[in-house]
Interface confidence: low
Amino acid sequence: TALSPTPTTMTFTPAPLEETTTRPEFCKWPCECPQSPPRCPLGVSLITDGCECCKICAQQLGDNCTEAAICDPHRGLYCDYSGDRPRYAIGVCAQVVGVGCVLDGVRYTNGESFQPNCRYNCTCIDGTVGCTPLCLSPRPPRLWCRQPRHVRVPGQCCEQWVCDDDARRPRQTALLDTRAFAASGAVEQRYENCIAYTSPWSPCSTTCGLGISTRISNVNARCWPEQESRLCNLRPCDVDIQLHIKAGKKCLAVYQPEEATNFTLAGCVSTRTYRPKYCGVCTDNRCCIPYKSKTISVDFQCPEGPGFSRQVLWINACFCNLSCRNPNDIFADLESYPDFEEIAN
């Protein structure tokens, strides 16, 4: 390579303002906004500025930020003004850094994912370890299987169900059943040397606003693991849900807007209106997470060009969970929740 490698990082510190302790005014009233909002890079949030005036592209990690040019709330960024003492006028967008975790004597950094063994995938989040079971709640095959057996498979970590009356089941039904069965949660079932597998949906990539959730499934013609994705929106970013909590109550588990609206995605609009339910907030340090949900298909029509459809998380109910410290860690201790099947699906 042209420049000999030595990994290193250099961060940008904002140039100090002229030597004065007066803070500049970044907000102007009445609001003065350009006629058309800026076009943001793909994947960057278009948000209302800190002055509550104009639409701006959210500042990202390492960008300058002010009370007007605010950091991307969807990416867990905050404005670090420490490099601009004593005015604290221009900062740099920084990641909220949490504390690490210790498990079985091993220290993990905040955000680090690891597998303590072959059965669990864990993530350290703000001092707490949340784990996703990799051998998820195996259940015996249903309907056609009268003699299920739970067996260990050589070279594989997770136990599997096999059906001793395989020879007697109708071929077509078996295939359909296996597929419906696999799609209902993270389960494994042998079918002609193919173990059908569908993982649970990953947590939504954002705690508010539009995010992405993914899962791995080999329920396809090739029995090949493929990543499926769906859009998710746990709660709107621009609504202060706490204002909707009734007096004397500690939470509003489900928030639902009064009117049905269209979903919008990259300038394209859903062909019909929806009145989605969102997860609310819990004001007593519990976190509000989806409890019953499903995936729906939403058709979008674009102003120019063809339309398209996308899978979207549809929330039926949410609840305030005591053990979940990270608002997005919806798979911690999953199996102890009621209606696990509906959460996984």
Partner: antibody, heavy 119, light 110 residues
């Protein structure tokens, strides 16, 4: 290791169209962009797409004549230019944006696809 | 016509220091910062720095990037023959809604 693999070189006649592909390994939620470089010239952004969303974003200059599409299942982006002109002769690069779309640059690049427009 | 302005060429001696500049406006470099790319003949560009002035792992510590207002600069110390290449700055322009590039600077190591 993240890789972008582009389709092979093309020789086309003026007025025809060409479709170049770019297959990305890994996550399909990163924007894939198309950048061209005419012989001896600088880099010029044409547009981009996030395969998982499927909605493209074009540079004004190329709007209408260039179509960018993606196949989410194979994590492949396509760039088609219609009504080819001699001045479209260039190396066409596919480039992926990195984490934190607003500050990471186009951090992974394909090997390039040479499109020659000749009569 | 490139949106960002770079000097067409810079020549420096072996083991000397070269500083390349890139000037834009408040909707690109001034707003988002600039990234730097290096391109050797016949090869695709390679990222040297991110727009927050940090470097990807594996990029030499002989390289320094900085930004002041609407301008960014790339400094390479202790120049080596392999540093001879074209260098481009790039930024996202929020008013154009597009990635923009400089015209490129050809660095010659004498």
């Amino acid at each position: 290791q993240m890789q972008l693999v582009q389709s092979g070189a093309e020789v086309k006649e003026p007025g025809s169209s060409v479709k170049v592909s770019c297959k990305a390994s890994g996550d399909n939620s990163y924007p894939l962009n198309w950048v061209r470089q005419a012989p001896g010239q600088g880099l010029e952004w044409m547009g981009g797409i996030i395969p998982i969303f499927g909605t493209p974003n074009y540079a004004q200059k190329f709007e209408g004549r260039v179509t960018i599409t993606a196949d989410e299942s194979t994590n492949t982006a396509y760039m088609e230019i219609s009504s080819l002109r001699f001045e479209d002769t260039a190396m066409y690069y596919c480039a992926r944006e990195g984490d934190g779309y607003n500050y990471s640059p186009l951090d992974y690049w394909g090997q390039g696809t040479l499109v020659t427009v000749s009569s | 016509q490139a949106v960002l302005t770079q000097p067409p060429s810079v020549s420096k001696g072996l083991r000397q220091t070269a500083t390349l500049t890139c000037t834009g406006d408040s909707s690109n470099v001034g707003n988002q910062g600039a990234a730097w790319l290096q391109q050797h003949p016949g090869l695709p560009p390679k990222v040297l720095s991110y727009r927050n002035n940090s470097r990807p792992s594996g990029i030499s510590e002989r390289l320094f990037v900085s930004r002041s207002g609407n301008s960014a600069s790339l400094t390479i110390t202790g120049l080596q023959p392999e540093d001879e290449a074209d260098y481009y700055c790039s930024a996202w322009d929020s008013s154009l809604g597009a990635w923009v590039f400089g015209g490129g600077t050809q660095l010659t190591v004498l």
